[in-house]
Interface confidence: low
């Protein structure tokens, strides 16, 4: 039966706890500035309404779509216009335009205070006093800062967050137990958010076909023993799940993700031998585990690809009959044979193959025309291989911090118009590719590095889209999803850039730098480095290194001084003068 009441259907499928959590996430991702208490009130109202529909699906308004119900509820917020400005205009629209309007107003960089972690005892007291509110607050704070966070996965993070407090608040040394767990959740959460943001950007900016191509390649690498039809089914279902989550349809998304996990586990014999452990876990852990599962072993004796895709007389016939199916089969066959390639490289190869067939199948002698198509792949494969080799050598030479600095200089020179905080954040993340991927053997380096870089460059793209300042960034971000990294790699110094006026205030530091964590101190120094490059884009590496070394010595000296503030004032002036001289400012 088609459900009379969608809200009752989802409430019954998901259960009250998950229903409430997902509605809270959905509301916080839409209205990112609203206070916690307001959201809790709205969620409770929706939950009470859902219960009346469970009791009687024919009750008033129970037949309305979830978008209508949730949108109507969001539009009851009294301060909508003064808090959100033009977003309030969404409420004048009808569904589905109203939901699209809310989606367009999601802010990847909301103006929210940084989350400061309270003392461990304070957190444990809050956890014990009201566990439910404490966990809801976690969902709320993450969701509003990460409006595209994958909602069912956030439920998994919340479960781990709860487990950490349950265990550690009873431990002898609470801090030693809890803080590493919270650090791990924070870092994993940021990574998870960024990965999901790329999936949503792929769907929203480049369309379903682009996402499906990505999914075919990734799932074929992960499940190389699965038949093409099986991979296609998984891709279709996965696309639906991510379309829903990226579209704000979090209840449907979570429900469908659970169904997909169930299907995968029921059919693991025809999918992968690596799923057994995952499938023994409870739902949230199971779904997470499946999403992270290692690649299965490749089947032995896979025939050469050339037979079906180059040598066969039927290549153009098969291509013409069902272009996307044939290209999907090519991508599947290539990807299952190449777990050592990045997904984006596999997609570049498929695109090259498609372009060749488009051209050659219209030629007088198609076979003669496409016979050498695999030769065209060689430079495409070698480019990321060489780039990774060079950058891993540089990383091993410099270590993470200095490698990040090298990237900061490189990217600031490429796109100096981009805001300093964005350049620092993106370059720091780009630099983490070293410690994340360079430790891997050759066969795992490229998928690790290039697919991670795709995620980080997408952060740059979504932040830049909010306030576009560079045509070069816009071009690399919008022309081709799979060629973003090569596009940025190919950018040279921007010769059209007019250097920034020198402002001594930018390079004035105070004693508060001494109490910062090592990470925060690095960010301060890296911010100064970006500003230096913006003032002097033609500065050499040696000049910049000398200034940065002087700067590090200055901070170390003044942090050891008795009168720190005076030291920073006096020595700071000398440092600025010396730096100006060194750089010819």
């Amino acid at each position: 039966d088609a459900h009379k009441s969608e809200v009752a259907h989802r409430f019954k499928d998901l259960g009250e706890e998950n229903f409430k959590a997902l509605v809270l996430i959905a509301f916080a991702q839409y209205l990112q500035q609203c206070p916690f208490e307001d959201h809790v009130k709205l969620v409770n109202e929706v939950t009470e309404f859902a219960k009346t529909c469970v009791a009687d699906e024919s009750a008033e308004n129970c037949d309305k779509s979830l978008h209508t119900l949730f949108g109507d509820k969001l539009c009851t917020v009294a301060t909508l216009r003064e808090t959100y400005g033009e977003m309030a205009d969404c409420c004048a629209k009808q569904e589905p335009e109203r939901n699209e309007c809310f989606l367009q107003h999601k802010d990847d960089n909301p103006n929210l205070p940084r989350l400061v972690r309270p003392e461990v005892d304070v957190m444990c007291t809050a956890f014990h006093d009201n566990e439910e509110t404490f966990l809801k607050k976690y969902l709320y704070e993450i969701a509003r800062r990460h409006p595209y966070f994958y909602a069912p996965e956030l439920l998994f993070f919340a479960k781990r967050y709860k487990a950490a407090f349950t265990e550690c608040c009873q431990a002898a040394d609470k801090a030693a137990c809890l803080l590493p767990k919270l650090d791990e959740l924070r870092d994993e959460g940021k990574a998870s958010s960024a990965k999901q943001r790329l999936k949503c950007a792929s769907l929203q900016k480049f369309g379903e076909r682009a996402f499906k191509a990505w999914a075919v390649a990734r799932l074929s690498q992960r499940f190389p023993k699965a038949e093409f039809a099986e991979v296609s089914k998984l891709v279709t279902d996965l696309t639906k799940v991510h379309t829903e989550c990226c579209h704000g349809d979090l209840l449907e998304c979570a429900d469908d993700r659970a169904d997909l996990a169930k299907y995968i586990c029921e059919n693991q014999d025809s999918i992968s031998s690596k799923l057994k452990e995952c499938c023994e876990k409870p739902l949230l852990e199971k779904s997470h585990c499946i999403a992270e599962v290692e690649n299965d072993e490749m089947p032995a004796d896979l025939p050469s690809l050339a037979a079906d895709f180059v040598e066969s007389k039927d290549v153009c016939k098969n291509y013409a009959e069902a272009k996307d199916v044939f290209l999907g089969m090519f991508l599947y066959e290539y990807a299952r044979r190449h777990p050592d390639y990045s997904v984006v490289l596999l997609l570049r190869l498929a695109k090259t193959y498609e372009t060749t067939l488009e051209k050659c199948c219209a030629a007088a002698d198609p076979h003669e025309c496409y016979a050498k198509v695999f030769d065209e792949f060689k430079p495409l494969v070698e480019e990321p291989q060489n780039l990774i080799k060079q950058n891993c050598e540089l990383f091993e030479q410099l270590g993470e911090y200095k490698f990040q600095n090298a990237l900061l200089v490189r990217y600031t020179k490429k796109v100096p118009q981009v805001s300093t905080p964005t350049l620092v954040e993106v370059s720091r993340n780009l630099g983490k590719v070293g410690s994340k991927c360079c430790k891997h053997p050759e066969a795992k380096r490229m998928p690790c590095a290039e697919d991670y870089l795709s995620v980080v460059l997408n952060q740059l793209c979504v932040l830049h889209e909010k306030t576009p300042v560079s045509d070069r960034v816009t071009k690399c971000c919008t022309e081709s999803l799979v060629n973003r990294r090569p596009c940025f790699s190919a950018l040279e110094v921007d010769e059209t850039y007019v250097p920034k006026e020198f402002n001594a205030e930018t390079f004035t530091f105070h004693a508060d730098i001494c109490t910062l964590s090592e990470k925060e101190r690095q960010i301060k120094k890296q911010t100064a480095l970006v500003e230096l490059v913006k003032h002097k884009p033609k500065a050499t590496k040696e000049q910049l290194k000398a200034v940065m070394d002087d700067f590090a010595a200055f901070v170390e000296k003044c942090c050891k001084a008795d009168d720190k503030e005076t030291c920073f004032a006096e020595e700071g002036k000398k440092l600025v003068a010396a730096s100006q001289a060194a750089l010819g400012l």
Partner: nanobody
Framework: QVQLQESGGGLVQPGGSLRLSCAAS????????IGWFRQAPGKEREGVSC????????NYADSVKGRFTISRDNAKNTVYLQMNKLKPEDTAVYYC????????????????WGQGTQVTVSS
């Protein structure tokens, strides 16, 4: 249980009309493109018409253009095929099928299929 159920078939005279319905149960049609296909005895299954999930994009086989109209009512979880000016060569079993978001170029691109409803055009 995911199901598509066709209805509205029957016997009709040439030049007559029928309205086929395709009702979904176990899932919501909002995210699905729905295609209508037909299979005459001894022939391959062929595409007749399709409507994308948004409802904004529709397509028709040349043989039915101007005579058949596809539409959807997501609130009722149902897609319709209005068939006017029917001809004897329209006689076949009519199937509806669902695929995520957009219409497919091939029969095997569809995820869910109905059992079919018989349409007979004869005087």
């Amino acid at each position: 249980q995911v199901q598509l159920q066709e209805s509205g078939g029957g016997l009709v005279q040439p030049g007559g009309s029928l309205r086929l319905s395709c009702a979904a149960s176990g899932f919501t049609l909002d995210y699905y493109a729905i295609g209508w296909f037909r299979q005459a005895p001894g022939k391959e299954r062929e595409g007749v018409s399709c409507i994308a999930s948004s409802g904004g994009s529709t397509n028709y086989a040349d043989s039915v253009k101007g005579r058949f109209t596809i539409s959807r009512d997501n609130a009722k979880n149902t897609v319709y095929l209005q068939m006017n000016k029917l001809k004897p060569e329209d006689t076949a079993v009519y199937y509806c099928a669902a695929a995520v978001l957009e219409c497919r170029t091939v029969v095997r691109g569809y995820d869910y299929w109905g059992q079919g409803t018989q349409v007979t055009v004869s005087s």
